[in-house]
């Protein structure tokens, strides 16, 4: 009997009957046995097959067969009901050997001329399975030349078995409050040889409670308490488990913030596992009852560790703890069963008593003393001296606690005080100085301080002067002493002001000339307006036409009188705007240098002279009734003349203030 | 961390007006809270000088109402003390506080002297 | 204004004894009373806020209670860093206002 060849020669070849392609003889039996690599099988397929044909191939036949499998008994030409003749069949082993026995009987009817196979070894596709066969390996398999190997999806790893896939199941942690955990794969078979351990890890004072749901399948045993596969769940207090089967288990109220469930598995079966709900409960806190005007948000049936609400006060309502303010508040539930927070009151807003206002006063409108929530009040001036400027002064107590105009504004009214009021009426006389009545120039300042000189007041806490007035005092503003509501110049009662600061045109130069020869002085305080002590108004844009030519200005101070000594009481004079094309002639004659006269000056006075502010006078305003708003403005500051005052042909010169509005507004709303 | 911050001078003379800043981290003042000053004087007596609330509304100790101004810078996260005409009794260590006290500056020593 | 009296200026105490700190208020401010510990050098510290919420890193033997008029601060196991003063304090109304402190020492 040949053997055939052995692995690890090549495995190929070819096989006939004995006398192929002639007839094979009576009472022959040949068997060849071949084998192949590990890993290899062998394939066998006839080119030629031609023996006779007996019921069930009892008398010759060739016969197939892989280890104690006989793979096929073949005879005749072709197949019939009952025997099989090879026709284009491949045949393989079931392993790496097949054995092929041909046999022959005692007679035959006619010749027949037998066989001829050929066959080679072939790798095995072991990842190849026939149906209803377990597959080869658990999740993945891959073939190769003489072998295979499986491997797993992700989550999964290769037990030492190298087919079973077993499940990376372990470590997984829940925090949350709440949440469902399964078998791996459910509701799909569970893996097999694998060791899962799933953790729920909550904060102390919360306990866990654990509901299987859906549907519930471990592999079990009639006898024998879960011995294959279980599911046990562990907290710090007992032990539940071990379980399995199919019938759903209880609710388990754990009592413990802690679980460990652990789900073991053996290498068979094919069960769907299980499915856990799990939810938390801890100590309730009291339930929040809401303060008066106020309200509790989120509400909910019961409030548990972490969980938490706000309060929201209606509008015109505010978070208050004790007397102290929150923009916000959130109270949180302890693991003891208390709240974190004490709960605030919901108190209306009080904006509290209104802030006095500078020389005004405030009304109580909706009620002596009612500063809550959309109470009203009403602001004024002190009437004829001072004028409301911004708003009507109608405040109201808004939701944020703020008293409120109706424009929006947070800040108090301001009361200006109003300017240009004097208790003269001009008469139009040009001649003759005259002694001021108390109210004619409640404007007028007196300056002491090295020289005696005079000022304009602006507003209630400037003055309005010449450079040359106070250039030496431009460093020690309070060496000024500042003098106001008094028509003697040396009465001891006055109105005392001091000097903050002094503000000298960047454009004079003393000693040069007096272009630009004016001052403002800011007050460390401001005045208090009466009808002595009144501004002067600046000129609007339409003052020039109070200034013509030979309209009459008026002239006020302390100045030099015709008797060559200071004023003991106020004096003014009413003098004429001098063309100014004259007044520059004037002035073009020595001892003047050329250009005396700028256009940054006015001149007012009379040809023949005699009407003249002079020395003392210096820094004063001249003053134009604005006959339109018959308020007096400055027009003037008196700043330099001939060496006589009063002289004829010569003109007092004066500031044109006009030119000046954009510096005085600047430097008043810069300080 | 909630920190605050006391600044100013150690020392002012009678009649003058004393400036404080209190300068807070970690927390903004207008999120939340009122913004205390409170001052302790020699022997431990503390008393409370009012406060700015996250708003900007202010509430004064009627004892001081007529020299005290609390105002707050909220780009700098600051707020200030401003109290006018001090005088010895004035002396004390200043301290800046949130809320009903739950964190306290470290302090300023205040001593009010010609 | 409402005072706050602290009747007892020092108190003596042992290490892991139980000490009441009290604070009267002269009307009623609720449950609005504050708590503070200071030690020399240092500024007041929170302990209690409310009557009877801790602040926020207090040990729990330092707890509180009371309303209305009458607050005790107890700490329930005096240790050697507890030996400080203790003032009580006020939020309930304007002005708020400070208890004149009680001083913890060694027996």
């Known amino acids: 009997t040949p053997l055939g060849p052995k692995w690890p020669e090549p495995v190929f070849g070819r096989l006939a009957s004995p006398g192929f392609p002639g007839e094979y003889a009576n009472d022959q039996e040949r068997r060849w046995t071949l084998t192949a690599p590990p890993g290899y099988r062998l394939r066998l397929y006839f080119t030629h097959f031609d023996l006779e044909l007996s019921h069930l191939c009892e008398y010759d036949f060739v016969k197939l067969s892989s280890g104690a499998k006989v793979l096929a008994t073949l005879c005749g030409q072709e197949s019939t009901d009952t025997e099989r003749a090879p026709g284009k069949d491949t045949f393989y082993s079931l392993g790496s050997s097949l054995d092929i026995t041909f046999r022959s009987d005692y007679s035959n009817e006619k010749p027949f001329t037998g066989f001829e196979a050929f066959y080679a070894a072939e790798d095995i596709d072991e990842c190849q399975v026939a149906p209803g066969e377990a597959p080869t390996c658990d999740h993945h398999c891959h073939n190769h030349l003489g072998g295979f190997y499986c491997s797993c999806r992700a989550g999964y790893v290769l037990h030492r078995n190298k087919r079973t896939c077993s499940a990376l199941c372990s470590g997984q942690v829940f925090t949350q409050r709440s949440g469902e955990l399964s078998s791996p794969e459910y509701p799909r078979p569970y893996p097999k040889l694998s060791s899962c351990t799933y953790s729920i890890s909550l904060e102390e004072g919360f306990s866990v409670i654990l509901d299987f749901v859906e549907s519930f399948d471990v592999e079990t045993h009639p006898e024998t308490l879960c011995p294959y596969d279980f599911l046990k769940i562990q907290t710090d207090r007992e032990e539940h488990g071990p379980f399995c089967g199919k019938t759903l288990p209880h609710r388990i109220e754990t009592k413990s913030n802690t679980v460990t469930i652990t789900f073991v598995t053996d290498e068979s079966g094919d069960h769907t596992g299980w499915k856990i709900h799990y939810t938390s409960t801890a100590q309730p806190c009291p339930y929040p009852m809401a303060p008066p005007n106020g309200h509790v948000s989120p509400v909910q049936a019961k409030y548990i560790l972490k969980d938490s609400f706000s309060i929201f006060c209606e509008t015109g309502y505010e978070l208050l703890q004790g007397h102290l303010p929150l923009k916000s508040f959130t109270a949180v539930c302890q693991k003891d069963g208390s709240w974190d927070r004490p709960m605030p009151a919901c108190s209306i807003v009080d904006c509290g008593p209104p802030d006095d206002l500078p020389s005004g006063r405030v009304e109580y409108i909706t009620g002596p003393g009612v500063t809550t929530y959309k109470a009203v009040i009403q602001y004024s001036c002190e009437e004829t001296f001072y004028t409301m400027k911004v708003n009507d002064g109608k405040y109201v107590c808004e939701a944020d606690g703020f008293w409120t105009s109706s424009k929006g504004e947070k800040s108090l009214p301001v009361c200006e005080p109003v300017c240009g009021l004097s208790a003269r009426t001009t008469g139009g006389r040009i001649y003759g100085g005259q002694k001021a009545k108390p109210g004619d120039f409640p404007w007028q300042v007196l300056i002491l301080g090295g020289t005696t000189a005079a000022g304009a007041l602006l507003y209630d806490n400037w003055v309005l002067t010449a450079a040359h007035a106070v250039y030496e005092q431009k460093h020690d503003a309070s060496a000024l002493d500042i003098r106001m509501g008094t028509l003697k110049r040396l009465s001891p009662h006055y109105t005392q002001a001091w000097s903050e600061a002094v503000f000298i045109h960047e454009g004079y130069t003393h000693d040069a000339g007096f272009d630009n020869d004016i001052a403002l002085i800011k007050l460390n305080n401001k005045v208090v307006i009466n009808s002595n002590i009144t501004p002067i108004c600046l000129p609007r844009k339409e003052a020039e036409s109070f200034m013509r030519t030979d309209d009459i200005g008026t002239a006020s101070g302390w100045g030099l009188t015709q008797r060559g000594f200071l004023a003991r009481n106020l004096m003014y004079v009413d003098i004429p705007i001098v063309d100014h094309q004259k007044c520059t002639a004037a002035y073009e004659k020595p001892p003047y240098p050329r250009g005396s006269v700028t256009a940054n000056m006015l001149c007012a006075g009379l040809e023949s002279g005699g009407k003249d502010s002079c020395r003392g006078d210096s820094g004063g305003a001249l003053v134009f009734l604005d006959s339109e708003t018959e308020r007096w403005f400055v027009g003037g500051i008196v700043s330099w003349g001939s060496m006589n005052c009063g002289e004829a042909g010569q003109y007092g010169v004066y500031t044109k203030v006009i030119n000046y509005i954009p510096w005085i507004e600047n430097i008043i709303s810069d300080f | 961390d909630v920190q605050l911050q006391e600044s100013g001078p150690g020392l002012v003379k009678p009649s003058q007006s004393l400036s404080l800043t209190c300068t807070v981290t970690g927390y903004s003042i207008t999120s939340d809270y009122a913004w205390n000053w409170i001052r302790q004087f020699p022997g431990n007596k503390l008393e409370w000088m009012g406060y700015?609330?996250?708003?900007?509304?202010?509430s004064y100790n009627p004892s001081l109402k007529s020299r005290i101004s609390i105002t707050r810078d909220t780009s700098k996260n600051q707020f200030f003390l401003q109290l006018n005409s001090v005088t010895a009794e004035d002396t004390a260590t200043y301290y800046c506080a949130r809320y009903w006290g739950d964190y306290w500056g470290q302090g300023t020593t205040l001593t009010v002297s010609s | 204004d409402i005072v706050m009296t602290q009747s007892q200026k020092f108190m003596s105490t042992s290490v892991g004894d139980r000490v009441s700190v009290t604070c009267k208020a002269s009307?009623?401010?609720?449950?609005?009373v504050a708590w503070f510990q200071q030690k020399p050098g240092q500024s007041p510290k929170a302990l209690i806020y409310?009557?009877?919420y801790r602040s926020s890193g207090v040990p729990d033997r330092f707890t509180g209670s009371g309303s209305g008029t009458d607050f005790t601060l107890t700490i329930s196991n005096v240790q050697s860093e507890d030996l400080a003063e203790y003032f009580c304090?006020?939020?309930?109304?304007?002005?708020?206002?400070f208890g004149g402190g009680t001083k913890l020492e060694l027996k």
């Open positions: 304090q006020q939020f309930n109304s304007n002005p708020l206002t």
């Open positions: 700015i609330s996250y708003s900007g509304r202010t």
């Open positions: 009307q009623n401010v609720g449950t609005n």
């Open positions: 409310s009557t009877s």
